[in-house]
């Protein structure tokens, strides 16, 4: 942006000029984008409460298991075994857990009368030993039960294992039992009270309302909203059978979900439940399978200290509170249709890339001659023509030229380097369509200047037989009219071209070249259209009228402004203009690049 | 699950020199620790050499200064260089392999033959003149 100058610049604004099309296809594509994004707009606003201001669900959890549970033991007693049958009840088969979570116990192990003294290690791979080389005084093995004495002692028959300080006996290294012992939790019930807050809306509700039938269970179908859920129905719900997870025990996830829209108008907020197995179910035997820990029930006997190790399966539930609670708020509609705005531009840039591709040279050149049904696209390059001011980077090496004999023009951006421009290719570029407006600006002499002695008043054509080449013309020179540059050795080659690029007549020649470029009369008219009160003394008068020839030849020659800031006047021309508006003393400076 | 086989074993006169070698299938070798055993007729097996998985080495009392045992992971391969034989050296040897992915096998156990839970079918050496 320009730097600040006055007042009044502060107080402007800038916007853009656009080009309109009536075209019957690109209006219709116009209106499709514009209605799909709509569409789609609208829809994403109410499907999902974009208009709301979401906030995360704060909660606390509280849960009570119920059921009796019968379980029948085989203990060993006196090399005897022997089976047993006990109840457990909700404190014998649940456990005090931190966070959300509640655990039930559904098989076990037990080591029972273990006290503090020397014994011989279970046998294992790592236990057993052949002498007391294998074994080793005060080490302690992670996977080991006691801190090794360094002895290998007998442990049963020839079974020799090393002696530990430990809880004596060992806790043997034996599988779970199957069935679980606990087999009947299954049929458990749990009640979960879900308390949630949503500060920042002032809201607060809670999973079960006051006119709950407590004594419902959970369905998914037909009791959505019971807050009891039975133990092998969550199981069943995550396809599980808890005949399988009971015996190696397991986590599962208890998930309650609060979608709440808490607009007034639209008012809703009820938890959804699902669940989820949150173990491994297919873990490898030696990266422990299921979910155990070990607890021990202390006593004395006899004064000695002793303790039944427990080694509990069971699986422990986990719940998971998540969710959010939406509400009106014009901040986030005005933002959600402030972000959505720019999808709108998607047509523009569609239907400019529709313009642009087949306004191509790509189409123009290999797909337009071929294909008769593309043939309407060609309108495209109208359109890109009006919709696109292409504009060449003004270097120091950029030049235009243009031939009578050719219908374009010719640009040179690249460095002489002691060619002639004559010889120079350049790039082909079409010559401006003639704006025959700026005509009107001339003054009437050119229009109905009287008929010259000899000359017929029809459009004078050049002469079709070329002009016979003087000693003087240069080798460059093609219409015999040109002369040497006055410029030094490393300047030369840019005034080294003439009108035409094959042999001919001079532009020179031309009635036109008199009336529009040398005619004192019309010039004089152009200098005072732009300065009307214009004074000049001889001298300085042939300096302007010699430049505003000079203007006039590149305008009439090359019609964009742009490409005439640029143009390169041919030699003929250029004497010609000067012999008509000499300079009274001193070289001439030839052409000089505007920027 | 690894499969052990043990090649090199034959006749060879007393104070000769053999190589032994034990060669491992699986990708999972570097994570063993292997030794070498031998049982003469009528006798109980014995321990000779072993190596852990990280390099420690270990030999039987009757072989030591004369027994070298080495490992090579790109191979799969357990060389057991054999020399100064004696005609008590005639025994079938056997390969072992013991686990040590979830702990390694402490230094003063690499002798225990309950370590090993992998063994080969063993290759003959007789040591005679």
């Known amino acids: 942006m320009p730097a600040c100058c006055s007042c009044s610049d502060v107080f402007q604004y800038e916007t853009n000029k656009v080009t309109r099309i009536q075209s019957m296809n690109y209006g219709t594509i116009k209106w499709f984008f514009h209605v799909i994004i709509f569409s789609y707009v609208c829809f994403a606003l109410v499907s999902d409460k974009l208009y709301q201001r979401k906030e995360p669900v704060i909660s606390s959890v509280h849960t009570k298991v119920k059921g009796i549970a019968e379980v029948k033991e085989e203990i060993v007693e006196n090399g005897v075994k022997k089976l047993v049958h006990s109840v457990f009840d909700t404190a014998d088969y649940t456990f005090p857990l931190q966070g959300n979570s509640f655990f039930v116990m559904t098989n076990f192990l037990k080591t029972e009368g273990q006290e503090q003294r020397l014994c011989p290690e279970y046998p294992t791979r790592r236990t057993l030993c052949s002498s007391d080389r294998g074994c080793k005084k005060g080490w302690m093995d992670p996977q080991s039960k006691g801190i090794q004495t360094g002895r290998c002692v007998v442990y049963e028959g020839n079974q020799k294992t090393c002696e530990v300080s430990a809880w004596c006996p060992i806790e043997a290294v034996e599988e779970a039992p199957r069935p679980a012992l606990l087999n009947s939790a299954e049929n458990f019930t749990v009640l979960i009270k879900n308390n949630i807050d949503f500060p920042g809306h002032n809201y607060t509700t809670r999973n079960i309302l006051p006119g709950l039938n407590i004594t419902c269970t959970f369905h998914k179908t037909q009791n959505p909203q019971c807050p009891i859920f039975r133990l092998g129905d969550i199981f069943r719900e995550t396809g599980d059978n808890f005949s399988d997870v009971a015996i190696q025990g397991g986590i599962m996830g208890i998930e309650i979900y609060w979608d709440c829209n808490l607009d007034r108008w639209f008012h809703h907020c009820r938890p959804k439940y699902s669940f989820r197995r949150l173990d491994d179910k297919t873990t490898n035997v030696s990266l422990y399978p299921g979910y155990n820990f070990r607890y021990a029930k202390y006593y004395k006997e006899n004064n000695v200290e002793k303790r039944t190790l427990i080694k509990v399966f069971g699986i422990r539930f986990d719940i998971l509170v998540f969710g959010t609670g939406g509400k009106f708020d014009i901040i986030q509609l005005v933002v959600y249709i402030g972000s959505t705005l720019s999808y709108f531009g998607l047509a523009a840039v569609f239907i400019d890339f529709l313009i642009d591709t087949y306004s191509s040279n790509c189409c123009r050149s290999h797909i337009y001659p071929w294909c008769k049904c593309c043939q309407p696209c060609v309108v495209n390059e109208y359109y890109y023509r009006k919709k696109c001011e292409s504009i060449v980077e003004p270097k120091p090496t950029l030049k235009y030229v243009s031939f009578v004999d050719e219908s374009h023009i010719r640009m040179v951006n690249q460095q002489l380097l002691g060619r002639s421009l004559q010889d120079v290719k350049g790039q082909e570029v079409p010559r401006p369509a003639m704006d025959f407006t700026d005509l009107s600006r001339l003054p009437l002499a050119l229009h109905d200047t009287p008929p010259i002695p000899g000359q017929p008043e029809e459009i004078q054509l050049l002469r079709k037989e070329a002009t016979p080449r003087s000693r003087d013309s240069p080798v460059w020179c093609q219409c015999g009219s040109c002369l040497p540059s006055q410029l030094p050795e490393s300047h030369r080659c840019l005034e080294e071209l003439c009108c035409r690029k094959k042999p001919g007549a001079c532009i020179t020649t031309s009635e036109l070249f008199r009336k529009l470029v040398l005619s004192r009369h019309v010039l004089q008219f152009l200098l005072l259209y732009q300065e009307p009160l214009l004074a000049l003394d001889v001298d300085s008068t042939n300096s302007r009228l010699r430049h505003c020839a000079y203007r006039c030849y590149a305008t009439w020659r090359f019609g964009s402004q742009d490409m005439a800031d640029f143009a390169i006047l041919p030699s003929c021309c250029r004497w010609r203009i000067r012999k008509e508006f000499p300079k009274s003393e001193g070289q001439y400076s030839g052409f000089k690049s505007p920027y | 699950e690894v499969q052990l086989v043990e090649s090199g074993g034959g006749l060879v006169q007393p104070g000769g020199s053999l190589r032994l070698s034990c060669a491992a299938s699986?990708?999972?070798?570097?994570?063993?620790?292997m030794g070498w055993f031998r049982q003469a007729p009528g006798k109980e097996r014995e321990f000779v050499a072993a190596?852990?998985?990280?390099?420690?080495?270990d030999y039987g009392d009757s072989v030591k200064g004369r027994f070298t045992i080495s490992r090579d992971d790109s191979k799969n391969t357990v060389p057991l260089q054999m020399n100064s034989l004696r005609p008590e050296d005639t025994a079938v040897y056997y390969c072992?392999?013991?686990?040590?992915?979830?702990?390694?096998?402490?230094?003063?156990?690499?002798?225990?033959?309950?370590?090993?839970?992998?063994w080969g079918q063993g290759t003959l050496v007789t040591v005679s003149s």
């Open positions: 072992a392999a013991a686990d040590e992915t979830l702990g390694a096998v402490p230094n003063f156990r690499l002798h225990e033959k309950y370590e090993y839970e992998y």
């Open positions: 190596i852990s998985s990280y390099g420690s080495t």
């Open positions: 699986g990708r999972t070798f570097r994570h063993y620790a």
